[in-house]
């Protein structure tokens, strides 16, 4: 469950739950920082807008960054 | 299956101090944000603190901040409240509920039974 | 601070009537952060609804969640003897407090 916050992390909880890349409207990286320590991802989904926080360590998650970062590829001229 | 376990409350003087334990079974306890609500005798419910997943967010209710602090022991399944400078009107039931993580806000998704917290001289 | 009023304070049904709950909130809530429970006597609290309108797992279809802005609902639209309980409405903003409407007490007529 991400909470909005100017400063600390965002991501209350974290998901394990491997996404579909087709359902995502968005999918935010945002690196530690002096705000927060830890590398937070943030998936929006293309049904209601819904976000999730994922969580970086899972294998699912993994494969799903790799599967956007190849289609972004495939993507870029 | 999935479960909250409260232990700890019981009959306290006023400005002694209490640890309430959650103990947690049944799902991945490391990925959850987890709640402290309690509800005083006949009345509504209270929301007094939320911890991250990880233990580096953690916010309270303005009755309780100073007094009390939330933490957790992800290695032991276990949500904690150390209540100091207890007051009367923090006689309640205390519930630990767990932040359902599988989406932006799904609500408090598994309770436990409750432990009593009484303070009287 | 988010403050949320429920109304009304009782509401005295008989079974398979019709049952709608309001929750008003202080200031604009965005749906995705409104959720509804229900609270039997000597029970812990119940998640019904998520998002305003998203039912929880395992929860009857006769549950129903509505409404946008300030403006909630709970909506139960056949009263079964076990929906006679409390029914709180929480709100989960952009900042704590996560605060409770003080309940609605749906009993039998």
């Known amino acids: 469950v991400p909470l909005s916050r100017t400063v600390r992390c965002t991501c209350i909880s974290i998901s394990n739950q491997p996404v579909n890349p087709r359902s995502l409207e968005k999918l935010e990286i945002i690196p530690a920082s002096q705000f927060c320590p830890r590398v937070e991802i943030i998936a929006t989904m293309k049904k209601k807008g819904e976000k999730r926080c994922l969580n970086p360590e899972s294998k699912a998650i993994k494969n799903l960054l790799k599967a956007v970062s190849k289609e972004r590829s495939k993507r870029s001229p | 299956q999935v479960q909250l376990v409260e232990s700890g409350g019981g009959v306290v003087q006023p400005g002694r101090s209490l640890r309430l334990s959650c103990a947690a079974s049944?799902?991945?306890?490391?990925?959850?944000?987890m709640h402290w609500v309690r509800q005083a005798p006949g009345k509504g419910l209270e929301w007094v603190a939320l911890i991250g997943y990880d233990g580096i967010n953690e916010y309270y209710a303005d009755s309780v901040k100073g007094r009390f602090t939330i933490s957790r022991d992800n290695s032991k399944n276990t949500l904690y409240l150390q209540m100091n400078s207890l007051r009367a009107e923090d006689t309640a039931v205390f519930y630990c509920a767990r932040d359902w993580p599988e989406g932006y806000y799904n609500g408090m998704d598994v309770w436990g039974q409750g432990t009593t917290v009484t303070v009287s001289s | 601070e988010i403050v949320l009023t429920q109304s009304p304070g009782t509401l005295s049904l008989s079974p398979g009537e019709r049952a709608t709950l309001s929750c008003r909130a202080s200031?604009?809530?965005?749906?995705?952060?409104l959720a509804w429970y229900q609270q039997k006597p000597g029970q812990a609290p119940r998640l019904l609804i998520y998002?305003?309108?998203s039912r929880a797992t395992g929860i009857p279809d006769r549950f129903s969640g509505s409404g946008s802005g300030t403006d909630f609902t709970l909506t139960i639209s056949r009263l079964e003897p076990e929906d006679f309980a409390v029914y709180y409405c929480q709100q989960y903003g952009s900042s704590p407090p996560f605060t409770f409407g003080p309940g609605t007490k749906v009993d039998i007529k």
């Open positions: 200031q604009s809530v965005s749906s995705s952060y």
């Open positions: 049944g799902f991945t306890f490391s990925n959850c944000g």
């Open positions: 998002g305003a309108s």
